[in-house]
């Protein structure tokens, strides 16, 4: 039975040209995290394998940095980066947990962070 929950940074906004940390946290389960995939819509941004470490997709290598932790840092943001991001936790023995983050990249210098929320 899957008992875990994923806490994410929720709906967030950031300035064009700036950077942002996408963060998810899996709690309420003793399952072992074997791999975390970060995806934007249908595109794979990065993989963090528990044993083998990080793989950043070549098309994002210049603008995506691993961490902190299992999170992902997006740099040199453009308005095209606006959209949904997913952290997909592959665990043993529970299975897969998915968290969703919506990022809005703003032209203005006012970029407020949204509240944290939980996805069961």
């Amino acid at each position: 039975m899957m008992t875990g929950t994923i806490e994410t940074t929720g709906n967030i906004s950031a300035e064009k040209g700036g950077s942002i940390i996408l963060q998810c946290h899996l709690s309420s389960t003793t399952a072992q995290v074997t791999q975390v995939n970060w995806e934007q819509q249908d595109q794979l941004l990065a993989i963090c394998n528990a044993d083998l470490g990080w793989h950043i997709s070549p098309s994002f290598k210049d603008r995506v940095a691993p961490g902190p932790g299992l999170g992902l840092t997006l740099q040199s943001l453009t308005v095209n980066d606006t959209g949904e991001y997913f952290c997909i936790y592959h665990t043993y023995p529970d299975g897969t947990y998915t968290g969703r983050i919506f990022l809005e990249v703003l032209e203005s210098s006012v970029a407020e962070h949204g509240a944290r929320f939980q996805i069961p």
Epitope: T34, Q35, N37, D42, L44, I47, N49, D51, L52, G53, H55, H90, T96
Partner: antibody, heavy 123, light 107 residues
Amino acid sequence: QVQLVQSGAEVKKPGASVKVSCKASGYTFTSHYMGWVRQAPGQGLEWMGIINPSMGATSYTQKFRGRVTMTRDTSTSTVYMELSSLRSEDTAVYYCARLHVSGSYYPAYLDYWGQGTMVTVSS
Amino acid sequence: EIVMTQSPATLSVSPGERATLSCRASQSVSSNLAWYQQKPGQAPRHLIYGASTRATGIPARFSGSGSGTEFTLTISSLQSEDFAVYYCQQYIVFPWTFGGGTKVEIK
């Protein structure tokens, strides 16, 4: 041309260990991860794990953790797979297979395979 | 782990006919899917990667399609050397997993 040459067939008793070797040639050994796959008689293919020949880092399937050890010797371009506490269900052909992509474990299908090593576990 | 299911288990086809093999993933693997061919007593041979791209030297009669959870390998006109077992495999989530295989036999 890329070649993966594996060690010869082995017959082992239950409880023993076996160490299978896979010698690579025809490419830069440390640039490609190596996977191990096994196939029991008349059965399908089963993923066992992977090793990064450059760093020595490994990732094993949960089923084999605690029983399998994958190592490499960069001086001879050889990877090894050792399986301990053998039981009759471990009777299978063991294959090493190279991951296609250079310098990463993704996205990497298995492009070259060794000829296989038959391991028979019998009392 | 991601479970890969192949169907049918056995496919009986006459030489020159078309063969269609299916592979289903228990969750999306995007296009991170490979197909392999294995003949008796031999190691698997890589045919297709990225769900639809033929490996070097693979004849054009082999084609792959699909994305997400549903995939197909089509052999447009079966030659005598194509009778073998075919396996699909996902390579997005460890442990990488194979389907149970489809045996293509002579009708």
